[in-house]
Amino acid sequence: MAVTACQGLGFVVSLIGIAGIIAATCMDQWSTQDLYNNPVTAVFNYQGLWRSCVRESSGFTECRGYFTLLGLPAMLQAVRALMIVGIVLGAIGLLVSIFALKCIRIGSMEDSAKANMTLTSGIMFIVSGLCAIAGVSVFANMLVTNFWMSTANMYTGMGGMVQTVQTRYTFGAALFVGWVAGGLTLIGGVMMCIACRGLAPEETNYKAVSYHASGHSVAYKPGGFKASTGFGSNTKNKKIYDGGARTEDEVQSYPSKHDYV
């Protein structure tokens, strides 16, 4: 029972985590304009992995995709790759873990096969979570570096008369979503790996022991009077019921190019 609960919980936690990783990857707020120097700006900039956006105080939001691949920073490409790898691994892990769930019966699948599948999905979730955490952390590090660089040359004056303020960017909501989601996927993966240990059938062979009683030549098999109780042919002791795998349609909404707030 505890094994089933651990496996089920691991699956649910991982599912939430992977949904979060997908959401974070699609989000536009990976970096947002730092408002420390101008908290009442009429133009607010924010950037994602795929496009950069500008929200005017008028309510108009304009987003422009990064239509170049070669012109993008290598770090951004690396973050994209890490997040995509994380999503792909997580998605495969989810698929594998659905079939590995103890509460779902597929044909005459052995517990050993389910244990292996649980372990495989668990490892996939762990790697997926690590990819997401790594991707988000690389991006955060890039932001911190750029932040202090732009702070160093925040104002460049033209003869001390005209000020040109350089836009600084700070952590966006997507980073926090990514960190939490990556952590959840990681925890879910660990739970799956723990569940795997409980799912693996015991390898101990219980050999029949002969007890010679005086005057009788009767061999007693451990397990009592019924051969099928406990240790007999029915060693699996399966809990059987049909658990339907549910799939939820996730709709990712994007701000339109003419989005009045």
Partner: antibody, heavy 118, light 113 residues
Framework: DVQLVESGGGLVQPGGSRKLSCAAS????????MHWIRQTPEKGLEWVAY????????YYADTVKGRFTISRDNPKNTLFLQMTSLRSEDTAMYFC???????????WGQGTLVTVSA | DIVMTQSPSFLTVTAGEKVTLSCRSS????????????LTWYQQKPGQPPKLLIY???TRESGVPDRFTGSGSGTDFTLTISSVQAEDRALYYC?????????FGTGTKLELR
């Protein structure tokens, strides 16, 4: 057709109060940020206050902060400017304006004159 | 606050002439996020409210004659009227649309001979 009509102007004594209204029609009022802008022959155009479509954020010019309050009633398509502790320098023609692309004002009302004098 | 300076204050021209109105800001109005300049031009005729001519420094508002052209970037901007007509006699204002408080220039009064 987009229309903005201001009302509530008039002669006020220094230290007195006045509430200006701006009735909007011809567009989805709840979808736009709105402003009050004033004009005097001496100072020219001066931005006074801004209110976003959902009433937050709200911004004021330093000259009116703490004395003026901008508000809106979306179901009634009306913008307000509550003016208190009025000074002679607040004497101006007050316009309401609709916020548009590029943080510009694409439609203005005809204005309402507020005169602060003893 | 961003200070907007317009020059000249007064301008008298002949109909059909090309006119250039200047506007300078104390701080750059160029937004790095979308590479747009947040500067707006308005025209105000006597007894009327201001009318929007150009936003984003060079985008002409619908219904505005194409003789009106906005240009410039960063801190220096110009409004050009290619061939002045009698109905262009008005006050022209530039506005900082980049940060609050939204500030206006002192205006340029265009007169016709």
């Amino acid at each position: 057709d987009v229309q903005l009509v201001e009302s509530g102007g008039g002669l006020v004594q220094p230290g007195g109060s006045r509430k200006l209204s701006c009735a909007a029609s011809g567009f989805t009022f709840s979808g736009f940020g709105m402003h009050w802008i004033r004009q005097t022959p001496e100072k020219g155009l001066e931005w006074v206050a801004y209110i976003s479509s959902d009433s937050r954020p709200i911004y004021y010019a330093d000259t009116v902060k703490g004395r003026f309050t901008i508000s809106r009633d979306n179901p009634k398509n009306t913008l307000f400017l509550q003016m208190t502790s009025l000074r002679s320098e607040d004497t101006a023609m007050y316009f309401c304006g609709r916020f548009y692309y590029g943080n510009s004002f694409d439609h203005w009302g005809q204005g309402t004159l507020v005169t602060v004098s003893a | 606050d961003i200070v907007m300076t317009q020059s000249p204050s007064f301008l008298t021209v002949t109909a059909g002439e090309k006119v250039t109105l200047s506007c300078r800001s104390s701080q750059s109005l160029l937004n790095s996020g979308n590479q747009r300049n947040y500067l707006t031009w308005y025209q105000q005729k006597p007894g009327q409210p201001p009318k929007l001519l150009i936003y984003w420094a060079s985008t002409r508002e619908s219904g505005v004659p194409d003789r009106f052209t906005g240009s410039g970037s960063g801190t220096d901007f110009t409004l050009t009227i290619s061939s002045v007509q009698a109905e262009d006699r008005a006050l022209y204002y530039c506005q900082n649309a980049y940060s609050f408080p939204l500030t206006f220039g002192t205006g340029t009064k265009l007169e016709l001979r």
